[in-house]
Amino acid sequence: EPPTACREKQYLINSQCCSLCQPGQKLVSDCTEFTETECLPCGESEFLDTWNRETHCHQHKYCDPNLGLRVQQKGTSETDTICTCEEGWHCTSEACESCVLHRSCSPGFGVKQIATGVSDTICEPCPVGFFSNVSSAFEKCHPWTSCETKDLVVQQAGTNKTDVVCGPQDRLR
């Protein structure tokens, strides 16, 4: 009876379990009753990082110097190239597809530490009593306005993104 499921590192084709190709190799032809799966190593600038049945290897990532990228780790037949940014610049994402001078802290966050050549901007959430309503790479969280010192009262509470709104005190007649 033909199998309905195969072991690990195998795949089901034509009612038969064939071996997957190992990382660094691509599939040339499926196995048959009489032959093993045929695999071929990936080319010079290609890779496959899993046991697979792919007929084409993936191209290594290109670290484009025009985007400020350089090679951090050269790719192999089993791993992709890892890019990083030129000194003083920082990756825009985990995948490091482009570089920025430094990242900003979003509204609700303030700058804890300004970026340097080696470390990007460090942000911190604005605690109660403080706010930031801008995206910035240098501005800290600002304290809420003190209505009391202006002889006013709080008309609208502040948040981590907005200042309090002060208004006149209700005069008792």
């Epitope: 985007l67 400020g68 940014c85 610049w89 482009s98 570089c99 920025v100 001078l101 501005e139």
Partner: nanobody, 116 residues
Framework: EVQLLESGGGLVQPGGSLRLSCAAS????????MWWVRQAPGKGLERVSA????????YYADSVKGRFTISRDNSKNTLYLQMNSLRAEDTAVYYC?????????RGQGTLVTVSS
């Protein structure tokens, strides 16, 4: 296309002054925080000064505090850096930058040389 064109650099004696300008185009200048950064020969990038979009808040690195003044004219789409009491260690290529500043949008910079 974002363009940042720095100018105003040159050779100046220690103690002297220079005013750098950065003409911006290709984006809404008045909406962006702007920075001056510099790179001394053989050194990394140093963040020198920054200014918020309205020009009401500023930042200065400790190395330039009290000597440099950043300003902007949103009607002219121009950023400035007034540099006084210049020292040999201020010698560098100065770049202006917007936030966020992508590598491929950076300007060419202007060279400031402080020497007697």
């Amino acid at each position: 296309e974002v363009q940042l064109l720095e100018s105003g650099g040159g050779l100046v004696q220690p103690g002297g002054s220079l005013r750098l300008s950065c003409a911006a185009s290709g984006f809404t200048f008045r909406d962006y925080e702007m920075w001056w950064v510099r790179q001394a020969p053989g050194k990394g990038l140093e963040r020198v000064s920054a200014i918020n979009p309205q020009g009401t808040r500023t930042y200065y690195a400790d190395s330039v505090k009290g000597r440099f003044t950043i300003s902007r004219d949103n009607s002219k789409n121009t950023l400035y850096l007034q540099m006084n009491s210049l020292r040999a260690e201020d010698t560098a290529v100065y770049y202006c930058a917007k936030l966020p500043q992508l590598f491929h949008d950076r300007g060419q910079g202007t060279l400031v040389t402080v020497s007697s």
